[in-house]
């Protein structure tokens, strides 16, 4: 995800301050960039978020804003500072002519400027007139007071707080930042204005149809009566939450963002800051039947992004569109015909559909989990949501072919028990963005700050790749995949795990250039092998005969093609034990898999040998998948032979700690 994502129109202006004699002109060679929404109808030209460099103080932000106004006035332009940001991101919101952008980009401290754009409620239909009998009962679901230690913030429309479902559970804050409704003849009708927010509040914590019946909620109005808001209004709402958190620290916080707009660097950055302050953010993937990475906040990696499925575990179709998909989605949840509070009357219910409803389900589940284990970090919560999800139940044929492998086949579910999952070694698979077509382009997959990268693999639909390797970047390991000529591009795939007190390092062996292949092992005392990667400089690895076989009794060893450099991920952590599991098929086959047994977690997935007809390897839940070229295009059967290599680990330390707690 990161700021590398989105078909994002970035107009880069490398400008230096030679005019106006700026006392604090940017240093030579620095560039301030201008960004705008790639979706033209959603753009809001004339209003701009000026984001300042990270360490900028409030006084400097105010001074920069005043300087912009003064310099604009000298050129005969009127400007209006609408808001000065601090607490989450330094910067300010300004109403001004686009003619002033070049001037603004030259100001001291400016990091980037983003044109404001629209965000939208992610439910369809906006107000379905299918009212169910008052006090609908979901008899099969009556959890005891779930989520009572957690506060859920809802950034949405106004809500009907006296609805029987949510009365006394939702505190309506005085925060409101919404655009004017479109159309001259628009009549504000309270029930319509409150529809979306009321329904979602009910899904999260409603007395009868809510997921976390004990959770208390606070609502902020960032969407107008037509379900439309702005990126800037959402940013100010997130800042309000951060300030509230600082003024009055409470227990765990969940923020529900049931809205989506075009890819926004600034909205993603604000979500990242809030997440790193310990807040759990849950958002709608979007209802555009499109790659969720093209939308915000869905594309922010720190946010839990939720797609929608129906009662048959099919992806939800919404008119001609439907749920978003792709690598930026973390998991799916029910999002079709969801019964919830209707703002038509205080006892009315209505069904609504969309990724907003799906996100509300996950926000409720998150509240339940956090109430049971308030110390859970965002990374731990995300891993648990993934672990307890129903696996491989979604019919992937609904997704575009090139998105199927990237989209998680996971439907959110409540854990069978709110305690006792602590012994498990949790891992998830993180796909990079596509590298792009040139050989210069690489693909990078990153784990969350408190996750460990235990292995790295790569995948290319054409098979044109030069492998992958783990490397340090900014004090943390990342997984980088290398493109080969031909321009089809590659993906990097990181296996990201929760491994407390881990000390991991990468050991590399250069190409052996000998007939027996390249080998590398974990030689440090107490370090175990968690993953193997291989990277080659040659454009096309030839067939490697004889096939490389792992010597018996040497499980801590990575082996590979003699022309490749081999990288072993070696970790030391209390009680960590790992084993290698292989599944080889002598005849050519498009897919070879090997899975870890119950109680073991897949940490590494790679292919042997790494010849050019292997498209790559990746982990799906606890199964290692190795894909090869279409059988009909593969040459000899000896070349077609492929082995899937899984590394399965478990932590005795985590298991013991869990038993001691019980």
């Amino acid at each position: 995800q990161e700021d590398e994502d989105g078909d994002y129109e970035e107009l880069v202006l490398a400008l230096r301050s030679e005019e106006d004699g700026l006392a604090e002109a940017p240093e030579h060679g620095t560039t301030a960039t201008f960004h705008r929404c790639a979706k033209d109808p959603w753009r809001l030209p004339g209003t701009y978020v000026v984001v300042l460099k990270e360490e900028t103080h409030l006084s400097q932000s105010e001074r920069t804003a005043r300087r912009l106004q003064a310099q604009a006035a000298r050129r005969g332009y009127l400007t209006k500072i609408l808001h000065v940001f601090h607490g989450l991101l330094p910067g300010f919101l300004v109403k001004m002519s686009g003619d002033l952008l070049e001037l603004a980009l030259k100001l001291p401290h400016v990091d980037y400027i983003e044109e404001d754009s629209s965000v939208f409620a992610q439910s369809i239909p906006w107000n379905l007139e299918r009212i169910t009998p008052p006090r609908y009962r979901a008899d099969e679901y009556q959890p005891p007071d779930g989520g009572s230690l957690v506060e859920v913030y809802l950034l949405d429309t106004s809500i009907q707080s006296d609805h029987r479902e949510i009365e006394g559970r939702v505190m309506v804050t005085d925060f409101e930042n919404v655009p004017e409704e479109d159309g001259t003849r628009f009549h504000r009708q309270a029930s319509k204005c409150d529809s979306h927010g009321t329904h979602l509040a009910g899904v999260v914590s409603g007395r009868d149809a809510g997921v976390a019946k004990g959770a208390s909620m606070r609502s902020l109005r960032v969407l107008n009566c037509q379900g439309k808001g702005t990126v800037s209004g959402t940013l100010i709402g997130l800042e309000f939450i951060r300030k509230s958190q600082l003024v009055q620290p409470v227990g765990p916080l969940v923020v529900l963002l049931p809205l989506a707009g075009g890819y926004s660097r600034v909205l993603n950055a604000a979500c990242q800051r809030l997440a790193r302050a310990g807040v759990v953010l849950v958002t709608a993937a979007g209802n555009f039947r499109d790659d969720a990475c093209l939308y915000s906040p869905a594309s922010a990696p720190e946010v839990i992004t939720v797609g929608a499925t129906n009662a048959q575990d099919q992806p939800v179709t919404l008119g001609t569109l439907g749920t978003n998909f792709g690598r930026c989605v973390d998991l799916f949840a029910p999002g079709e015909d969801i019964i919830g509070a209707s703002s038509d009357c205080s006892t009315c219910f209505v069904s609504q559909s969309g990724t907003s409803q799906a996100a509300a389900h996950v926000a409720g589940i998150a509240a339940m989990m956090l109430s049971a284990e308030p110390e859970l970090t965002l990374a731990e919560l995300r891993q648990r949501l993934i672990h307890f999800s129903a696996k491989d139940v979604i019919n992937e044929a609904w997704f575009p072919e090139d998105q199927r492998v990237l989209t998680p086949n996971l439907v959110a579910a409540l854990p069978p028990s709110t305690h006792g999952a602590g012994w498990q070694l949790f891992c998830r698979t993180v796909w990079s963005a596509h590298s792009g077509p040139t050989r210069m382009a690489t693909a990078v997959a990153r784990c969350a700050p408190d996750e460990e990268l235990l292995s790295c693999s790569s995948f290319s639909r054409s098979g044109k790749r030069r492998g992958e390797r783990m490397e340090a970047q900014g004090g943390k390991l990342v997984c980088r995949a290398h493109n080969a000529f031909g321009g089809e591009g590659v993906y990097a795939i990181a296996r990201c795990c929760l491994l407390p007190q881990a000390n991991c390092s990468v050991h590399t062996a250069p190409p052996a250039e000998a007939s027996m292949g390249t080998r590398v092992h974990c030689h440090q005392q107490g370090h175990v092998l968690t993953g193997c990667s291989s990277h080659w400089e040659v454009e096309d690895l030839g067939t490697h005969k004889p096939p490389v076989l792992r010597p018996r009794g040497q499980p801590n060893q990575c082996v590979g093609h003699r022309e490749a450099s081999i990288h072993a991920s070696c970790c030391h952590a209390p009680g960590l034990e790992c084993k290698v599991k292989e599944h080889g098929i002598p005849a050519p086959q498009e897919q070879v898999t090997v899975a870890c047994e119950e109680g073991w977690t897949l940490t590494g997935c790679s292919a042997l040998p790494g010849t050019s007809h292997v498209l790559g390897a990746y982990a799906v839940d606890n199964t290692c998948v190795v894909r090869s070229r279409d059988v009909s295009t593969t040459g000899s059967t000896s070349e077609g032979a492929v082995t899937a290599v899984a590394i399965c680990c478990r932590s005795r330390h985590l298991a013991q700690a869990s038993q001691e707690l019980q």
Partner: antibody, heavy 117, light 110 residues
Amino acid sequence: EVQLLESGGGLVQPGGSLRLSCAASGFTFSSYAMSWVRQAPGKGLEWVSTISGSGGRTYYADSVKGRFTISRDNSKNTLYLQMNSLRAEDTAVYYCAKEVGSPFDYWGQGTLVTVSS
Amino acid sequence: QSVLTQPPSVSAAPGQKVTISCSGSNSNIGNNYVSWYQQLPGTAPKLLIYDNNKRPSGIPDRFSGSNSGTSATLGITGLQTGDEADYYCGTWDSSLSAVVFGGGTKLTVL
């Protein structure tokens, strides 16, 4: 020997269209990504578009998105650039390039496109 | 303006060494390979360096490339009058999904 020969340039009025061709020889055309890069008179290099070896993936600079279309005919070893709604700022020498930024990088000699009324 | 920043011109005497810098950001130089091109007057660009520091066959070892973080450098030793040309750095930008070039540096051999 690798050869790339651009053609189709010339003088065109603003709003008009032009189709550039690049005939390739001396290498397995379908195995390589191909690009168009342009250079306005007296200015630097500006990437225009790239197409993958199979033709399945295309990429464009923001300045030409929606106006230019890159395509290839692997059976004819030819790369194309269809340019519509041309503007004065599209005036440049257009180079056809093979596998930009790789050991197989090779550029043609270019064809001049002039957009003027 | 160019995404990658290069000095507009550099100069040195024959036999001397010269370096040309190219600065970018995490989304381009920081995460992708850099190439360097030489464009002699009136000719098409020619690849000098690829993958940050590798030379294609036929390029003398007087030309070298290096890179650190979000900057790249082209080094030319033993300057010759025939090296007078424009030099461009280029890479892939992951944010823009685009190939990006520097503005070019004119090398003058005094």
